[in-house]
């Protein structure tokens, strides 16, 4: 039993990781001309009781865990981005036109736990 | 096995549910003098593919959430809160003075898939 | 610098399927979009499609239906083959790159020299 | 589609003159989105223009471009030797991509 809890892998804190996405992949290759994908990172990870600084929180985060450590029907706050960037993109309008748009929100430039 | 998948409970989408914080509850009557408590709220849910407009959505969520339908490697977009507001409260201070603090992001006015 | 190379056989009989294929050097096959533009004997150009490393493709409407564009990461190369085809299809084949950024995205540089494919029985 | 139409089919100049050539497209070409290539024969074509304006690499500063919406022109101030050959334009502001029909450019 205590070698099997050993094991039981230590699940990492909210934090941001790669992820490329293939605009093919997805099927929006179609009215996507260029960038045919980007690196649009995603956040993961556990948002453990106490809520370290680096996690990036906001009071009710912190209220939410303390929470959930004393009654686990509450759920835990959520590993998300809380900072995002834009990218530009050429698209295909509904006249077959090449437009140039800023897409806001697209990439995660950091995670925390809301 | 036709009426366990029956009963089995449908997720609802994600919204914000009520929660009553008692400050004694989480060990903070200790410091805080008023209120004893107050009304957090908090967001639980699903966020589904394809993200519907109520469900306060970023770009980046959305792309997330269709990497998520073709690759459930990558975890879908979570329900957390979207729009938070503050409450006043007196504390004690390390002199046992008691002082009022407007406390930022305590309690949860929406939602959204992030 | 980057280098295209086409190659393939230079005569195809009617209804048969043309198959060419472009070899790039200098430049790995992951960064760009990769097109086809063909050119009938003493006639304009025509683009016939593209492709990314991924397989995202796009084709000219008029050909669609008969074009196949694919990618082989692996040998740096990608590869053309149109059905059906007529006496119509008697071109020089070029292979060529499009920048796939929104900065630079449309136009064909470099090309590669071409290569004459003749349908006839 | 986006057709581009191309004047003079030939133009005959001599060395050392100046070279006009024209691009016309049945609708606005957005962003400016226009090529010009040269290409001569036995050759595959070279880029000279992108973005309507903006040089490529290499390219002598004797070719310029200019135009937008739906009329663009390639010109040469001081024809070379070497600059006599067929001229296409091409539009990638709108799917599918299109060229014009060429312009031959032919010593006098």
């Known amino acids: 039993q205590a070698k099997h809890k050993q094991r039981k892998r230590l699940k990492s804190s909210c934090k941001r990781h790669p992820l490329y996405v293939d605009f093919s992949d997805v099927g929006w290759n179609d009215w996507i001309v260029a960038p045919p994908g980007y690196h649009a990172f995603y956040c993961h990870g556990e948002c453990p009781f106490p809520l370290a600084d680096h996690l990036n929180s906001t009071n009710h985060a912190i209220v939410q865990t303390l929470v959930n450590s004393v009654n686990s029907k509450i759920p835990k706050a959520c590993c998300v981005p809380t900072e995002l960037s834009a990218i530009s993109m050429l698209y295909l309008d509904e006249n077959e036109k090449v437009v140039l748009k800023n897409y806001q929100d697209m990439v995660v430039e950091g995670c925390g736990c809301r | 096995q036709a009426k366990h998948k029956q009963r089995k409970r449908l997720k609802s989408s994600c919204k914000r549910h009520p929660l009553y914080v008692d400050f004694s509850d989480v060990g903070w009557n200790d410091w805080i003098v008023a209120p004893p408590g107050y009304h957090a709220f908090y967001c639980h849910g699903e966020c589904p593919f394809p993200l519907a407009d109520h469900l306060n959505s970023t770009n980046h969520a959305i792309v997330q959430t269709l990497v998520n339908s073709v690759n459930s490697k990558i975890p879908k977009a979570c329900c957390v809160p979207t729009e938070l507001s503050a409450i006043s409260m007196l504390y004690l201070d390390e002199n046992e003075k008691v002082v009022l603090k407007n406390y930022q992001d305590m309690v949860v006015e929406g939602c959204g898939c992030r | 610098q980057v280098q295209l190379q086409e190659s393939g056989p230079g005569l195809v009989k009617p209804s048969e399927t043309l198959s060419l294929t472009c070899t790039v050097s200098?430049?790995?096959?992951?960064?760009?979009?990769w097109s086809w533009i063909r050119q009938p004997p003493g006639k304009g150009l025509e683009w016939i499609g593209y492709?990314?490393?991924?397989?995202?493709?796009r084709y000219n409407p008029p050909l669609k239906s008969r074009v196949t564009i694919s990618v082989d990461t692996s040998k740096n190369q990608f590869s053309l083959k149109l059905s059906s085809v007529t006496a119509a299809d008697t071109a020089v084949y070029y292979c060529?790159?499009?920048?796939?950024?929104?900065?630079?995205?449309?136009?064909?540089?470099?090309w590669g020299q071409g290569t004459l494919v003749t349908v006839s029985s | 589609e986006i057709v581009l139409t191309q004047s003079p089919g030939t133009l005959s100049l001599s060395p050392g003159e100046r070279a006009t050539l024209s691009c016309r497209a049945s609708?606005?070409?957005?962003?400016?989105?226009l090529a010009w290539y040269q290409q001569k024969p036995g050759q595959a074509p070279r880029l000279l223009i992108y973005?309507?304006?903006s040089r490529a690499t290499g390219i002598p500063d004797r070719f310029s471009g200019s135009g937008s919406g739906t009329d663009f022109t390639l010109t040469i101030s001081r024809l070379e030797p070497e600059d006599f050959a067929v001229y296409y334009c091409?539009?990638?502001?709108?799917?599918?991509?299109?060229f014009g029909g060429g312009t031959k450019v032919e010593i006098k």
């Open positions: 200098g430049d790995s096959i992951s960064s760009y979009y």
């Open positions: 492709i990314y490393y991924s397989g995202s493709t």
């Open positions: 609708q606005s070409v957005s962003s400016s989105y």
């Open positions: 973005g309507a304006s």
């Open positions: 060529a790159r499009i920048c796939s950024s929104t900065s630079c995205w449309g136009w064909f540089d470099p």
């Open positions: 091409q539009q990638y502001g709108s799917s599918p991509l299109t």
